[in-house]
């Protein structure tokens, strides 16, 4: 909650609850690594399982720069895109070209964001303006959500509401009181 209201109308993309972010083509230095990161317990009945926790989906990592107005993050941030088909975890490929895709004939399972994290980023701005920092909301993990015929797209907004809990880590202190301040200070990566 809360982040829905904090959607940035400038150039940064902050996914809202329940959205399915795709790496936008215009993102700078957008490197996608296809890694099936989100494993799960193997199902007892691979083709008839009813337990959503036994399903898994892909978490694709990509990097992007955060921009706000004329400012850009000193370093890119890495986040996940929830992608691919949900199926029994043991049948999901571990890498591209390996394993078999499983296509459910029954209910629809959707790969959606599960948890989010907030990360503080240091922004570099033209003209030597005051150092800037902002917090961006990044997808931390994905999950499969079973949809019944009673679900529709809008109802997905209710899912994935667990509060973002950023990892601990000292972040740079943007201390400068003049427009001439050096803003080359970088943020510690999470």
């Amino acid at each position: 909650q809360g982040w829905q209201a904090f959607k940035n109308d400038a150039t940064e993309i902050i996914p809202e609850l329940g959205e399915y972010p795709e790496p936008p083509p215009e993102l700078e230095n957008n490197k996608t690594m296809n890694r099936a990161e989100n494993g799960g317990r193997p199902p007892h009945h691979p083709f008839e399982t009813k337990d959503v926790s036994e399903y898994s989906c892909r978490e694709l990592h990509f990097t992007r720069y955060v921009t706000d107005g004329p400012c850009r993050s000193a370093k890119p941030v890495t986040e996940l895109v929830c992608s691919g088909q949900c199926g029994p975890a043991r049948l999901l490929p571990n890498a591209i070209g390996r394993g078999k895709w499983w296509r459910p004939s029954g209910p629809d399972f959707r790969c959606i964001p599960d948890r989010y994290r907030a990360q503080r980023v240091q922004l570099l701005c033209p003209g030597g303006e005051a150092p800037r920092a902002r917090k961006v909301r990044l997808v931390a993990s994905c999950k499969c959500k079973r949809l019944t015929r009673f679900h529709n797209q809008s109802e997905l907004k209710d899912f994935g509401t667990e509060a973002a809990r950023p990892q601990k880590g000292r972040k740079p202190r943007p201390r400068a009181r003049s427009a001439k301040a050096n803003q080359a200070e970088l943020e510690n990566a999470y």
Partner: antibody, heavy 118, light 107 residues
Framework: EVQLQQSGAELVRSGASVKLSCTAS????????MHWVKQRPEQGLEWIGW????????EYAPKFQGKATMTADTSSNTAYLQLSSLTSEDTAVYYC???????????WGQGTTVTVSS | DIVMTQSHKFMSTSVGDRVSITCKAS??????VAWYQQKPGQSPKLLIY???TRHTGVPDRFTGSGSGTDFTLTISNVQSEDLADYFC?????????FGGGTKLELK
Amino acid sequence: EVQLQQSGAELVRSGASVKLSCTASGFNIKDYFMHWVKQRPEQGLEWIGWIDPENGDTEYAPKFQGKATMTADTSSNTAYLQLSSLTSEDTAVYYCNAGQATYYFDYWGQGTTVTVSS
Amino acid sequence: DIVMTQSHKFMSTSVGDRVSITCKASQDVGTAVAWYQQKPGQSPKLLIYWASTRHTGVPDRFTGSGSGTDFTLTISNVQSEDLADYFCQQYSSYPYTFGGGTKLELK
């Protein structure tokens, strides 16, 4: 829904200190910067500073250094502003804000009126 | 400190009119300017940031423009609920500073 609930009005004696609170609901303050702004009828709005509740980083306007101290308690999702050595100049409404950024103020609390009496 | 000057303390308008509220910075602040609306007895609300970006939920009749030292908040098709105080704020350099405010009133 994003909400910032500030503590009630304060009537304090000159020379004393006061601590104002701002409790957030609908979001985690660790995920935002918390700002404080002062408003007086004739002087308008004045920025006091911001705090990053996650690690305690702060930035103060020079005018308020030594006068104001910002703290935050993430366990109670509350930000605090302590004002010391109060004078009539400190009589004002004090607003807390939550922002994604350190530089503009997305959402505001309802304000706390501080009246300093001599 | 950068001084933000709103030369008109009061501006009169009628419902349906278009009104422009101006703000001048004492030095170049690029586009690092925000606008806030404050209705009587309420706390301020963010309308515009980066001089021209509307905040979430702000009606599109509110438009911000300008860069450098001169900034304008334009309200087209003024509604009765727009009668309020409007403040500009610069965040180009510390300390962040606000304009003195412009009160929008009915003629």
